[in-house]
């Protein structure tokens, strides 16, 4: 049986300050059951960037249509990028539970921020 893959195709993305950054992530299967979340950084100090069900993330929107059935594209777009947004972003699949359990992370995409052209 094939194992679930979490695919972040770009190792790095460079964006000018003020622009939007698209961070791509797809999964190979709809199972195991459980949510996808995005984080910046790894380990216990990582920062939650996007979780559909909890929190308020005004600068982050999912790329795919939120009413799309059987979606396996969990890419996000972050608007109005600033230098403070630089870092490595991870797309993480969780297995549903109480609480949800981290199952697999993508390889990460490093976001670098260029100075806004004058």
């Amino acid at each position: 049986e094939e194992e679930l893959q979490v695919i972040q195709p770009e190792k790095s993305v460079s964006v000018a300050a003020g622009d939007s950054a698209t961070l791509n992530c797809t999964v190979s299967s709809l199972i195991p059951v459980g949510p996808i979340q995005w984080f910046r950084g790894a380990g216990p100090g990582r920062e939650l960037i996007y979780n559909l069900k909890e929190g308020h993330f005004p600068r982050v929107t999912p790329v795919s249509d939120p009413t799309k059935r059987n979606n396996m594209d969990f890419s996000i777009r972050i608007s109005n990028i600033t230098p403070a947004d630089a870092g490595t972003y991870y797309c993480v699949k969780f297995r549903k539970g109480s609480p949800d359990v981290e199952l697999k992370s993508g390889a990460g995409t490093e976001l670098s921020v260029r100075a806004k052209p004058s």
């Epitope: 299967s29 059987n70 979606n71």
Partner: antibody
Framework: EVQLVESGGGVVQPGGSLRLSCAAS????????VSWVRQAPGKGLEWVST??????YYADSVKGRFTISRDNSKNTLYLQMNSLRAEDTAVYYC???????????????WGQGTLVTVSS | EIVLTQSPATLSVSPGERVTLSCRAS??????IAWYQQKPGQAPRLLIY???SRDTGIPARFSGSGSGTDFTLTISSLQSEDFGVYYC??????????FGGGTKVEIK
Amino acid sequence: EVQLVESGGGVVQPGGSLRLSCAASGFSFSIYAVSWVRQAPGKGLEWVSTIGADDTYYADSVKGRFTISRDNSKNTLYLQMNSLRAEDTAVYYCAKDSTVGWSGDFFDYWGQGTLVTVSS
Amino acid sequence: EIVLTQSPATLSVSPGERVTLSCRASQNVRSDIAWYQQKPGQAPRLLIYAASSRDTGIPARFSGSGSGTDFTLTISSLQSEDFGVYYCQQYYDWPPFTFGGGTKVEIK
């Protein structure tokens, strides 16, 4: 065309066992969660169990008595029902789960159901 | 466990009339509601998901609305083939998935 065909229902005495099967076709069975939902005679719908990959979920009313499993090589879903009670009498439907956006699951295709009667 | 309460329990309607069915959740379920139609002796059929998205092949006379705790299924002009029982289901917080008790739509 998606098809779900249940089998294995019948009459069983209280305390007995039964194994239901659901043969699936018309979709990539191995990448979807699948579920059992039941309906007691003249009553509403009650979710019973869901299986993802090796992750399984049960209603409290059947936990410890029922076991859901799947065989992706045969495109088949199973429900092993032990220690059956009169209140388990119902039509048991196999249902394909569907997700929307980044959200939870609902049921977009259903089989026609198989009747399980628990009676002495 | 999230409890879904459907009202009315039974509705007698003449063909051509507008029908409004209600589903109320005991807590916020965002838009994670599906609606099903079940005719006697048949399996349920998905009508609406994500509170307002029609499933493939479902006639435009069926529409869903609402978010949070209050949801509505509307049949704009009831056809004779629309009789049956209608169930809402929440999938915001599970297990367990929960269904409403159903609304029976009878043809007057």
